[in-house]
């Protein structure tokens, strides 16, 4: 059995979560990839996804989430800027591989966002966030919708303990429309 593990990040409001999801280059370089949140008792919900096929080093922004897929590195970079307390939750990267169910990239991210002063005198993280302002023109796109006969019987674990699961794939439902926009530096 494959173990589902979590990596925990405790950040302050206004900070940036910046993580990288590693994938097999030969299999998944051009596959569409997504960032999901897993809420208690619910199936994973897609918050943002890359183009289909996924474009190399082409930033995609959905609200405060920026995805960049680096084919040459075999890495999907996910940034959530200007974090809010309500962003706290369990997240994961997945790769879409229709008609099969999405393939989950380990490990899941347990994000805890707290109120409070995030910096020290001279801290300048906020200046970096100007880069990620949404341009006035946006393009509407849909991430794939996956349904499954399986139902969720319990919430994902809140601890960082390992949890056994039969495989490394998970299911998607309740995926809603998203706005996908280019990011200009």
């Amino acid at each position: 059995a494959t173990k589902l593990t979590e990596e925990k990040y405790e950040l302050k409001e206004g900070q940036t979560l910046d993580v990288k999801c590693d994938y097999t280059l030969e299999k998944f370089a051009s596959s569409q990839k997504a960032w999901q949140i897993i809420r208690d008792g619910e199936m994973p919900k897609t918050l943002a996804c890359t183009e289909r096929p996924s474009k190399n080093s082409h930033p995609v922004q959905v609200g405060r989430i920026i995805l960049e897929d680096y084919h040459d590195h075999g890495l999907l970079r996910v940034r959530m800027v200007n974090l809010q307390v309500e962003d706290s939750g369990l997240y994961q990267c997945v790769i879409y591989q229709p008609p099969k169910e999405p393939h989950m990239l380990f490990d899941r991210i347990r994000l805890v966002v707290t109120k409070g002063f995030s910096g020290t005198p001279g801290s300048n993280e906020n200046s970096t966030q100007n880069v990620y302002k949404i341009p006035p023109t946006t393009t509407k796109a849909l991430c794939p919708l996956y349904t499954s006969p399986r139902t969720v019987t319990q919430a994902p674990p809140k601890s960082t303990a390992d949890v056994s699961t039969p495989d490394s794939e998970i299911n998607l439902t309740n995926v809603t429309d998203i706005i996908r926009v280019p990011v200009f530096n």
Epitope: D18, V19, T24, H73
Partner: antibody, heavy 119, light 108 residues
Framework: EVQLLESGGGLVQPGGSLRLSCAVS????????MSWVRQAPGKGLEWVSE????????YYADSVKGRFTISRDNSKNTLYLQMNSLRVEDTAIYYC????????????WGQGTLVTVSS | EIVMTQSPATLSVSPGERATLSCRAS??????LAWYQQKPGQAPRLLIY???TRATGIPARFSGSGSGTEFTLTISSLQSEDFAVYYC??????????FGQGTKVEIK
Amino acid sequence: EVQLLESGGGLVQPGGSLRLSCAVSGFTFSRYAMSWVRQAPGKGLEWVSEMRGSSGSTYYADSVKGRFTISRDNSKNTLYLQMNSLRVEDTAIYYCAKEFSSNSLFDYWGQGTLVTVSS
Amino acid sequence: EIVMTQSPATLSVSPGERATLSCRASQSVNANLAWYQQKPGQAPRLLIYGASTRATGIPARFSGSGSGTEFTLTISSLQSEDFAVYYCQQFYNWPPWTFGQGTKVEIK
């Protein structure tokens, strides 16, 4: 329990070669990036090389590029560092380190193996 | 390459007192910063990552703060086992991953 055990260090002349090994246990080796980090006697930490887990991408510090090669054998749960054209300034304790899945920070370290380059 | 600069090089503190260590990055690394503790003859140990998240098993007296270019590691009440060298490391963007030169915390 996560364990990393380096071996292969020793005394070598300038221009010589060594191959370091790092045998790991306690986690799914193939899933995680691994790095080599070195520490010259009485000095600070210097990252040397990294190999990603799923992608297999490799990266090197400028100081070792073209001379060192990182590799891994997932079936043996072992990380390697082939060091060629060794220089006196490569003398250091070499640590292998497991990385987080989500970022290149080092949550588990081996005890280190000493490489001495001297004539 | 992102250069990490730690200060002071040496910090003399009495047991029970508070220690404050600083780390500065040559450019913004957001919250992509870790702190390690190293005792003589031992491998480094991860203390803090993501600028402020304590690693598994690290006592609450260790705390990290900061974002962007300025970071602080605070040890609220130094215990005898805390006297060691502390390193910061950035893991922003792509390699090379760089460490600060270290701060030695010694008994006053």
